[in-house]
Protein backbone atom coordinates (compact mmCIF):
# COMPACT_ATOMS: atom_id res chain seq x y z
CA UNK A 1 0.00 0.00 0.00
CA UNK A 2 1.29 3.58 -1.03
CA UNK A 3 1.05 4.31 2.91
CA UNK A 4 3.29 6.25 5.34
CA UNK A 5 5.00 2.84 6.85
CA UNK A 6 6.03 2.01 2.42
CA UNK A 7 6.12 6.01 1.64
CA UNK A 8 7.86 7.32 4.22
CA UNK A 9 10.74 5.01 4.78
CA UNK A 10 11.51 4.48 0.82
CA UNK A 11 12.79 7.47 -2.06
CA UNK A 12 10.00 7.21 -4.31
CA UNK A 13 9.46 8.52 -7.58
CA UNK A 14 6.40 7.14 -8.21
CA UNK A 15 3.12 8.26 -7.30
CA UNK A 16 3.16 7.78 -2.76
CA UNK A 17 2.38 9.44 0.18
CA UNK A 18 3.63 12.53 0.75
CA UNK A 19 4.21 14.31 4.22
CA UNK A 20 2.38 17.95 4.52
CA UNK A 21 2.04 19.67 7.87
CA UNK A 22 -0.42 22.54 7.24
CA UNK A 23 -0.93 25.22 9.57
CA UNK A 24 -4.13 26.29 9.89
CA UNK A 25 -3.81 29.99 10.11
CA UNK A 26 -0.34 30.45 8.29
CA UNK A 27 -1.28 28.43 5.32
CA UNK A 28 -5.12 28.18 5.31
CA UNK A 29 -5.89 31.84 6.44
CA UNK A 30 -8.50 29.89 9.29
CA UNK A 31 -8.20 31.58 12.53
CA UNK A 32 -11.44 29.65 14.10
CA UNK A 33 -10.03 26.58 14.84
CA UNK A 34 -8.82 26.70 18.75
CA UNK A 35 -6.87 23.34 18.56
CA UNK A 36 -4.45 21.94 17.23
CA UNK A 37 -3.24 24.81 15.38
CA UNK A 38 -2.10 22.45 12.70
CA UNK A 39 -1.88 18.97 11.34
CA UNK A 40 -0.38 16.28 9.28
CA UNK A 41 -2.80 16.33 6.08
CA UNK A 42 0.05 14.68 3.84
CA UNK A 43 -0.46 14.38 0.14
CA UNK A 44 -0.38 12.25 -3.10
CA UNK A 45 2.31 12.58 -5.87
CA UNK A 46 4.38 10.82 -8.21
CA UNK A 47 4.39 9.50 -11.24
CA UNK A 48 1.56 6.48 -12.37
CA UNK A 49 3.91 4.06 -14.68
CA UNK A 50 1.86 0.64 -15.93
CA UNK A 51 0.32 -0.91 -13.50
CA UNK A 52 1.87 0.95 -10.25
CA UNK A 53 -0.75 0.90 -7.99
CA UNK A 54 -3.80 1.02 -10.79
CA UNK A 55 -7.29 1.86 -8.76
CA UNK A 56 -9.34 0.71 -12.16
CA UNK A 57 -9.42 -1.00 -15.23
CA UNK A 58 -9.56 2.04 -16.92
CA UNK A 59 -6.26 3.40 -14.92
CA UNK A 60 -4.60 -0.02 -16.57
CA UNK A 61 -5.76 0.71 -19.85
CA UNK A 62 -4.66 4.53 -19.83
CA UNK A 63 -0.80 3.27 -18.17
CA UNK A 64 -0.51 1.10 -20.70
CA UNK A 65 -1.73 3.45 -23.57
CA UNK A 66 0.78 5.63 -22.03
CA UNK A 67 3.48 3.41 -22.26
CA UNK A 68 2.93 2.50 -25.83
CA UNK A 69 2.72 6.42 -26.48
CA UNK A 70 4.98 8.25 -24.24
CA UNK A 71 4.06 11.07 -25.98
CA UNK A 72 0.35 11.22 -24.76
CA UNK A 73 -0.94 13.53 -22.57
CA UNK A 74 -3.41 11.14 -21.23
CA UNK A 75 -2.34 9.14 -18.12
CA UNK A 76 -3.59 7.92 -14.47
CA UNK A 77 -2.98 10.66 -11.40
CA UNK A 78 -1.77 9.93 -8.66
CA UNK A 79 -4.55 10.76 -5.78
CA UNK A 80 -5.81 9.63 -2.51
CA UNK A 81 -7.05 6.49 -1.01
CA UNK A 82 -7.96 6.35 2.31
CA UNK A 83 -8.64 9.66 4.14
CA UNK A 84 -9.33 9.91 7.96
CA UNK A 85 -10.91 12.54 9.84
CA UNK A 86 -9.28 15.01 12.22
CA UNK A 87 -10.97 16.11 15.54
CA UNK A 88 -10.71 19.72 16.44
CA UNK A 89 -11.71 22.52 19.19
CA UNK A 90 -13.49 25.80 18.37
CA UNK A 91 -15.64 28.32 20.00
CA UNK A 92 -18.98 29.58 19.34
CA UNK A 93 -18.67 32.69 21.35
CA UNK A 94 -17.55 31.53 24.95
CA UNK A 95 -18.74 28.05 23.96
CA UNK A 96 -16.32 24.98 23.24
CA UNK A 97 -17.39 22.54 20.53
CA UNK A 98 -15.62 19.58 19.48
CA UNK A 99 -16.02 18.20 16.04
CA UNK A 100 -15.06 15.58 13.23
CA UNK A 101 -13.83 17.46 10.13
CA UNK A 102 -14.24 13.92 7.76
CA UNK A 103 -11.86 13.12 5.15
CA UNK A 104 -8.96 15.34 6.19
CA UNK A 105 -5.59 13.52 6.49
CA UNK A 106 -4.75 11.48 3.67
CA UNK A 107 -3.59 7.94 4.76
CA UNK A 108 -2.66 6.33 1.40
CA UNK A 109 -2.72 6.98 -2.37
CA UNK A 110 -3.50 5.37 -5.63
CA UNK A 111 -3.50 5.42 -9.57
CA UNK A 112 -6.56 6.98 -10.84
CA UNK B 1 -20.93 17.77 -13.43
CA UNK B 2 -17.37 17.94 -15.23
CA UNK B 3 -19.25 15.16 -18.20
CA UNK B 4 -19.20 15.32 -21.55
CA UNK B 5 -21.92 17.62 -21.82
CA UNK B 6 -20.34 20.50 -20.12
CA UNK B 7 -16.23 19.83 -20.91
CA UNK B 8 -17.18 18.99 -24.88
CA UNK B 9 -19.32 21.83 -25.46
CA UNK B 10 -16.40 24.68 -23.32
CA UNK B 11 -12.90 25.57 -23.68
CA UNK B 12 -11.51 24.87 -20.01
CA UNK B 13 -8.53 24.83 -19.01
CA UNK B 14 -9.57 23.32 -15.24
CA UNK B 15 -9.82 19.73 -14.72
CA UNK B 16 -12.48 18.53 -17.42
CA UNK B 17 -13.40 15.40 -19.31
CA UNK B 18 -11.20 14.70 -22.10
CA UNK B 19 -12.00 12.93 -25.34
CA UNK B 20 -9.42 9.71 -26.00
CA UNK B 21 -10.21 7.50 -28.33
CA UNK B 22 -8.20 4.23 -28.12
CA UNK B 23 -7.55 1.66 -30.98
CA UNK B 24 -7.58 -1.59 -29.04
CA UNK B 25 -4.54 -3.24 -32.42
CA UNK B 26 -2.59 0.10 -32.22
CA UNK B 27 -2.80 1.99 -28.92
CA UNK B 28 -2.91 -1.05 -26.43
CA UNK B 29 -1.61 -3.82 -28.55
CA UNK B 30 -4.19 -6.07 -28.05
CA UNK B 31 -5.51 -8.30 -31.29
CA UNK B 32 -8.33 -10.26 -29.41
CA UNK B 33 -10.92 -7.72 -29.50
CA UNK B 34 -12.86 -8.64 -32.29
CA UNK B 35 -15.43 -6.05 -32.23
CA UNK B 36 -15.34 -2.78 -31.36
CA UNK B 37 -12.20 -1.88 -33.13
CA UNK B 38 -11.41 0.88 -30.58
CA UNK B 39 -13.75 2.67 -28.33
CA UNK B 40 -13.95 6.26 -26.81
CA UNK B 41 -12.02 5.78 -23.60
CA UNK B 42 -12.05 9.58 -22.32
CA UNK B 43 -9.67 10.85 -19.75
CA UNK B 44 -9.47 13.55 -16.77
CA UNK B 45 -7.18 16.34 -16.86
CA UNK B 46 -6.68 20.05 -15.97
CA UNK B 47 -5.57 22.54 -13.07
CA UNK B 48 -7.62 22.48 -9.59
CA UNK B 49 -8.44 25.59 -8.18
CA UNK B 50 -9.54 25.97 -5.33
CA UNK B 51 -13.10 24.31 -4.87
CA UNK B 52 -13.38 23.44 -8.72
CA UNK B 53 -15.30 20.11 -8.34
CA UNK B 54 -13.16 19.20 -5.02
CA UNK B 55 -13.80 15.94 -4.10
CA UNK B 56 -13.20 15.26 -0.38
CA UNK B 57 -12.55 17.90 2.34
CA UNK B 58 -8.88 16.99 1.83
CA UNK B 59 -8.85 17.84 -1.77
CA UNK B 60 -10.45 21.75 -0.51
CA UNK B 61 -7.83 22.41 1.93
CA UNK B 62 -5.37 21.27 -0.50
CA UNK B 63 -6.47 23.73 -3.05
CA UNK B 64 -6.87 26.58 -0.68
CA UNK B 65 -3.18 25.66 0.59
CA UNK B 66 -1.82 25.53 -2.99
CA UNK B 67 -3.77 29.01 -3.33
CA UNK B 68 -2.21 30.44 -0.69
CA UNK B 69 1.35 29.20 -1.08
CA UNK B 70 1.54 28.59 -5.15
CA UNK B 71 5.05 27.96 -5.50
CA UNK B 72 4.49 24.24 -3.29
CA UNK B 73 4.25 21.20 -5.21
CA UNK B 74 1.13 19.89 -3.32
CA UNK B 75 -2.46 20.30 -5.15
CA UNK B 76 -4.98 18.52 -5.94
CA UNK B 77 -4.66 16.17 -9.38
CA UNK B 78 -7.95 15.76 -11.59
CA UNK B 79 -9.24 11.72 -11.86
CA UNK B 80 -12.01 10.02 -12.99
CA UNK B 81 -15.27 10.02 -10.76
CA UNK B 82 -17.85 7.70 -12.71
CA UNK B 83 -16.89 5.15 -15.52
CA UNK B 84 -18.84 2.74 -17.31
CA UNK B 85 -17.96 -0.91 -18.73
CA UNK B 86 -17.79 -1.53 -22.45
CA UNK B 87 -19.31 -4.36 -24.32
CA UNK B 88 -17.07 -6.61 -26.39
CA UNK B 89 -16.94 -9.10 -28.99
CA UNK B 90 -13.79 -11.67 -29.04
CA UNK B 91 -13.95 -15.22 -30.22
CA UNK B 92 -12.51 -18.38 -28.58
CA UNK B 93 -11.88 -20.51 -31.59
CA UNK B 94 -14.72 -19.65 -34.33
CA UNK B 95 -17.09 -19.27 -30.94
CA UNK B 96 -17.84 -15.72 -30.71
CA UNK B 97 -18.35 -14.47 -27.25
CA UNK B 98 -19.93 -11.58 -25.17
CA UNK B 99 -18.35 -10.00 -22.80
CA UNK B 100 -18.40 -6.52 -20.52
CA UNK B 101 -15.11 -5.22 -19.32
CA UNK B 102 -15.69 -3.00 -16.18
CA UNK B 103 -14.30 0.96 -15.46
CA UNK B 104 -13.34 1.40 -19.02
CA UNK B 105 -14.89 4.38 -19.75
CA UNK B 106 -14.80 7.52 -18.11
CA UNK B 107 -17.93 9.55 -18.01
CA UNK B 108 -17.29 12.69 -15.31
CA UNK B 109 -14.44 13.90 -13.41
CA UNK B 110 -13.64 15.39 -10.17
CA UNK B 111 -10.74 17.27 -7.92
CA UNK B 112 -8.99 14.97 -5.72
CA UNK C 1 -13.29 -24.72 -19.59
CA UNK C 2 -10.00 -23.43 -19.80
CA UNK C 3 -7.12 -26.03 -20.37
CA UNK C 4 -3.56 -25.98 -20.47
CA UNK C 5 -1.95 -28.84 -21.39
CA UNK C 6 1.76 -29.71 -21.21
CA UNK C 7 3.94 -31.97 -23.23
CA UNK C 8 4.94 -34.94 -21.51
CA UNK C 9 8.22 -36.02 -19.27
CA UNK C 10 11.39 -35.73 -21.35
CA UNK C 11 14.66 -37.90 -20.47
CA UNK C 12 17.48 -36.13 -22.16
CA UNK C 13 21.65 -35.95 -22.05
CA UNK C 14 23.74 -32.68 -21.63
CA UNK C 15 24.36 -31.06 -24.67
CA UNK C 16 21.03 -32.32 -26.18
CA UNK C 17 18.53 -29.70 -27.24
CA UNK C 18 14.38 -29.57 -26.60
CA UNK C 19 11.39 -28.12 -27.01
CA UNK C 20 8.55 -28.41 -25.00
CA UNK C 21 4.97 -27.45 -25.58
CA UNK C 22 1.77 -25.86 -23.67
CA UNK C 23 -1.49 -25.72 -25.63
CA UNK C 24 -3.86 -23.71 -24.16
CA UNK C 25 -7.86 -23.74 -25.44
CA UNK C 26 -11.02 -22.66 -24.00
CA UNK C 27 -10.24 -19.49 -23.69
CA UNK C 28 -9.14 -16.47 -26.28
CA UNK C 29 -5.01 -17.81 -26.90
CA UNK C 30 -3.77 -14.33 -27.79
CA UNK C 31 -5.78 -12.36 -25.11
CA UNK C 32 -3.67 -13.71 -22.15
CA UNK C 33 -0.07 -13.64 -21.62
CA UNK C 34 1.66 -17.50 -21.27
CA UNK C 35 4.59 -17.65 -18.44
CA UNK C 36 6.87 -20.66 -18.13
CA UNK C 37 7.78 -21.22 -14.04
CA UNK C 38 10.89 -23.33 -12.95
CA UNK C 39 10.54 -25.66 -10.13
CA UNK C 40 13.98 -27.39 -9.28
CA UNK C 41 13.59 -31.07 -7.28
CA UNK C 42 12.52 -29.34 -3.09
CA UNK C 43 12.60 -26.27 -4.59
CA UNK C 44 10.48 -22.79 -5.19
CA UNK C 45 8.87 -21.41 -8.40
CA UNK C 46 11.25 -19.44 -10.35
CA UNK C 47 9.95 -17.20 -13.20
CA UNK C 48 11.79 -17.64 -16.41
CA UNK C 49 9.75 -15.14 -18.67
CA UNK C 50 6.68 -14.59 -20.92
CA UNK C 51 5.12 -14.47 -24.37
CA UNK C 52 2.09 -11.99 -24.94
CA UNK C 53 1.18 -14.93 -28.12
CA UNK C 54 -0.69 -11.92 -30.02
CA UNK C 55 2.83 -9.68 -30.61
CA UNK C 56 5.10 -12.59 -29.80
CA UNK C 57 6.79 -9.83 -27.76
CA UNK C 58 8.50 -11.71 -25.04
CA UNK C 59 10.61 -10.59 -21.62
CA UNK C 60 12.67 -12.85 -20.07
CA UNK C 61 14.08 -12.87 -16.61
CA UNK C 62 17.47 -12.13 -16.03
CA UNK C 63 18.48 -15.55 -14.76
CA UNK C 64 17.24 -16.91 -17.85
CA UNK C 65 17.96 -14.85 -20.33
CA UNK C 66 20.42 -16.17 -23.53
CA UNK C 67 19.55 -19.83 -21.23
CA UNK C 68 16.01 -20.47 -23.21
CA UNK C 69 13.87 -19.20 -25.70
CA UNK C 70 10.22 -18.78 -25.67
CA UNK C 71 7.64 -18.73 -28.82
CA UNK C 72 4.15 -19.26 -29.52
CA UNK C 73 2.19 -20.51 -32.54
CA UNK C 74 -1.26 -18.87 -32.48
CA UNK C 75 -2.52 -20.33 -35.00
CA UNK C 76 -2.28 -23.37 -32.71
CA UNK C 77 -3.17 -22.05 -29.75
CA UNK C 78 0.37 -23.86 -28.37
CA UNK C 79 3.70 -22.12 -26.17
CA UNK C 80 6.98 -23.50 -26.55
CA UNK C 81 10.10 -23.21 -24.34
CA UNK C 82 13.14 -24.92 -25.91
CA UNK C 83 16.81 -25.31 -24.98
CA UNK C 84 19.76 -25.61 -27.50
CA UNK C 85 22.26 -27.27 -25.21
CA UNK C 86 21.11 -29.14 -22.02
CA UNK C 87 22.58 -29.02 -18.68
CA UNK C 88 22.03 -31.28 -15.72
CA UNK C 89 21.30 -28.36 -13.86
CA UNK C 90 18.42 -27.88 -15.99
CA UNK C 91 16.37 -31.11 -14.78
CA UNK C 92 13.40 -29.28 -12.89
CA UNK C 93 9.38 -29.25 -13.65
CA UNK C 94 8.76 -26.73 -15.89
CA UNK C 95 4.91 -25.17 -16.17
CA UNK C 96 3.85 -22.94 -17.77
CA UNK C 97 0.75 -20.17 -16.89
CA UNK C 98 -2.00 -18.12 -18.71
CA UNK C 99 -1.14 -14.68 -17.26
CA UNK C 100 -3.35 -11.44 -18.08
CA UNK C 101 -1.29 -8.32 -19.01
CA UNK C 102 -2.51 -7.67 -15.36
CA UNK C 103 0.14 -9.44 -13.81
CA UNK C 104 -1.03 -12.83 -12.36
CA UNK C 105 -1.02 -16.30 -13.64
CA UNK C 106 -4.32 -17.75 -13.28
CA UNK C 107 -4.46 -20.91 -15.38
CA UNK C 108 -1.23 -23.39 -14.43
CA UNK C 109 -0.46 -26.44 -16.84
CA UNK C 110 -0.14 -29.80 -15.56
CA UNK C 111 3.61 -29.69 -15.26
CA UNK C 112 6.36 -31.31 -17.99
CA UNK C 113 9.10 -32.91 -15.90
CA UNK C 114 12.43 -32.80 -17.72
CA UNK C 115 15.41 -34.68 -16.65
CA UNK C 116 18.98 -34.58 -18.09
CA UNK C 117 21.76 -37.03 -17.04
CA UNK C 118 24.66 -38.70 -18.93
CA UNK D 1 15.82 -7.37 -10.70
CA UNK D 2 14.38 -7.65 -6.54
CA UNK D 3 13.47 -10.63 -3.94
CA UNK D 4 10.56 -11.15 -1.90
CA UNK D 5 11.02 -12.47 1.17
CA UNK D 6 9.00 -14.89 3.48
CA UNK D 7 9.37 -16.80 6.08
CA UNK D 8 10.06 -20.80 5.60
CA UNK D 9 7.38 -22.10 7.65
CA UNK D 10 4.27 -21.29 9.18
CA UNK D 11 2.64 -23.70 11.88
CA UNK D 12 -1.26 -22.91 13.04
CA UNK D 13 -3.45 -24.81 15.59
CA UNK D 14 -6.47 -26.33 13.33
CA UNK D 15 -9.38 -23.93 12.97
CA UNK D 16 -7.04 -20.75 14.32
CA UNK D 17 -5.74 -18.25 11.55
CA UNK D 18 -2.79 -18.49 9.59
CA UNK D 19 -0.96 -15.36 8.36
CA UNK D 20 1.78 -15.61 5.77
CA UNK D 21 4.02 -12.37 4.61
CA UNK D 22 5.70 -11.59 2.13
CA UNK D 23 7.90 -8.72 2.30
CA UNK D 24 9.85 -6.96 -1.08
CA UNK D 25 10.75 -2.96 -1.88
CA UNK D 26 8.52 -3.05 -5.23
CA UNK D 27 5.14 -4.28 -2.76
CA UNK D 28 3.81 -0.77 -1.89
CA UNK D 29 3.09 -0.05 -5.50
CA UNK D 30 3.06 -3.37 -7.27
CA UNK D 31 0.05 -5.84 -6.07
CA UNK D 32 1.28 -9.10 -4.74
CA UNK D 33 -0.06 -12.30 -5.88
CA UNK D 34 0.06 -15.36 -3.75
CA UNK D 35 -0.66 -19.05 -4.90
CA UNK D 36 -0.74 -22.72 -3.11
CA UNK D 37 0.78 -25.50 -4.19
CA UNK D 38 0.08 -29.10 -2.80
CA UNK D 39 2.33 -32.00 -3.16
CA UNK D 40 3.06 -33.06 -6.76
CA UNK D 41 0.37 -30.73 -7.91
CA UNK D 42 0.72 -27.75 -10.02
CA UNK D 43 0.30 -24.25 -8.04
CA UNK D 44 -3.43 -22.54 -7.87
CA UNK D 45 -3.83 -19.00 -8.20
CA UNK D 46 -5.58 -17.86 -4.38
CA UNK D 47 -5.31 -13.98 -4.29
CA UNK D 48 -4.81 -11.67 -7.35
CA UNK D 49 -4.73 -8.26 -7.57
CA UNK D 50 -5.23 -5.76 -4.27
CA UNK D 51 -7.44 -8.70 -2.58
CA UNK D 52 -9.24 -10.33 -5.00
CA UNK D 53 -9.99 -13.95 -4.64
CA UNK D 54 -11.39 -16.68 -8.39
CA UNK D 55 -13.52 -18.12 -7.87
CA UNK D 56 -13.63 -21.59 -5.94
CA UNK D 57 -11.11 -19.88 -3.58
CA UNK D 58 -13.12 -20.04 -0.28
CA UNK D 59 -13.93 -16.69 1.46
CA UNK D 60 -11.22 -17.78 4.37
CA UNK D 61 -8.56 -16.85 2.40
CA UNK D 62 -7.72 -13.04 2.40
CA UNK D 63 -5.06 -10.61 1.37
CA UNK D 64 -3.70 -7.25 2.96
CA UNK D 65 -0.97 -5.00 2.42
CA UNK D 66 0.94 -2.58 4.07
CA UNK D 67 4.36 -0.68 3.66
CA UNK D 68 6.23 -2.79 1.54
CA UNK D 69 4.67 -6.07 3.26
CA UNK D 70 1.94 -8.16 1.70
CA UNK D 71 0.27 -10.75 3.98
CA UNK D 72 -1.96 -13.71 2.89
CA UNK D 73 -4.63 -14.65 5.83
CA UNK D 74 -6.18 -17.69 6.06
CA UNK D 75 -8.82 -17.77 8.95
CA UNK D 76 -10.53 -21.28 10.07
CA UNK D 77 -7.19 -22.82 8.88
CA UNK D 78 -8.34 -26.37 7.36
CA UNK D 79 -6.20 -29.76 7.30
CA UNK D 80 -6.81 -29.28 3.21
CA UNK D 81 -4.63 -25.74 3.66
CA UNK D 82 -1.91 -28.06 4.47
CA UNK D 83 0.52 -26.31 1.62
CA UNK D 84 3.23 -24.62 0.45
CA UNK D 85 2.32 -21.06 -0.48
CA UNK D 86 4.02 -18.11 -2.73
CA UNK D 87 3.54 -14.61 -3.33
CA UNK D 88 4.77 -12.97 -6.79
CA UNK D 89 4.66 -9.40 -8.18
CA UNK D 90 6.54 -7.54 -11.23
CA UNK D 91 7.31 -4.45 -11.98
CA UNK D 92 6.23 -1.92 -14.66
CA UNK D 93 7.72 -3.98 -17.25
CA UNK D 94 6.09 -6.69 -16.00
CA UNK D 95 9.10 -8.68 -14.79
CA UNK D 96 7.97 -11.08 -12.73
CA UNK D 97 9.48 -12.64 -9.27
CA UNK D 98 8.31 -15.11 -7.19
CA UNK D 99 9.03 -15.27 -2.99
CA UNK D 100 10.83 -18.14 -1.43
CA UNK D 101 7.90 -20.02 -0.60
CA UNK D 102 6.30 -20.95 3.18
CA UNK D 103 5.20 -24.22 3.98
CA UNK D 104 1.91 -23.87 5.89
CA UNK D 105 1.49 -26.39 9.03
CA UNK D 106 -2.01 -27.25 10.17
CA UNK D 107 -1.67 -28.76 13.49
CA UNK D 108 -4.03 -31.17 15.28
Known amino acids: ALDAAYCFRNVQDNCCLRPLYIDFKRDLGWKWIHEPKGYNANFCAGACPYLWSSDTQHSRVLSLYNTINPEASASPCCVSQDLEPLTILYYIGKTPKIEQLSNMIVKSCKCS | ALDAAYCFRNVQDNCCLRPLYIDFKRDLGWKWIHEPKGYNANFCAGACPYLWSSDTQHSRVLSLYNTINPEASASPCCVSQDLEPLTILYYIGKTPKIEQLSNMIVKSCKCS | QVQLVQSGAEVKKPGESLKISCKGSGYSFTRYYVAWVRQMPGKGLEWMGWIDPGTSNTRYSPSFQGQVTISADKSISTAYLQWSSLKASDTAMYYC???????????WGQGTLVTVSS | SYELTQPLSVSVALGQTARITCSGDNLGGYYAHWYQQKPGQAPVLVIYDKSDRPSGIPERFSGSNSGNTATLTISRAQAGDEADYYCASYDSSLMMVFGGGTKLTVLG
Open chain 3, 97 to 107: ARMLAWGWFDY
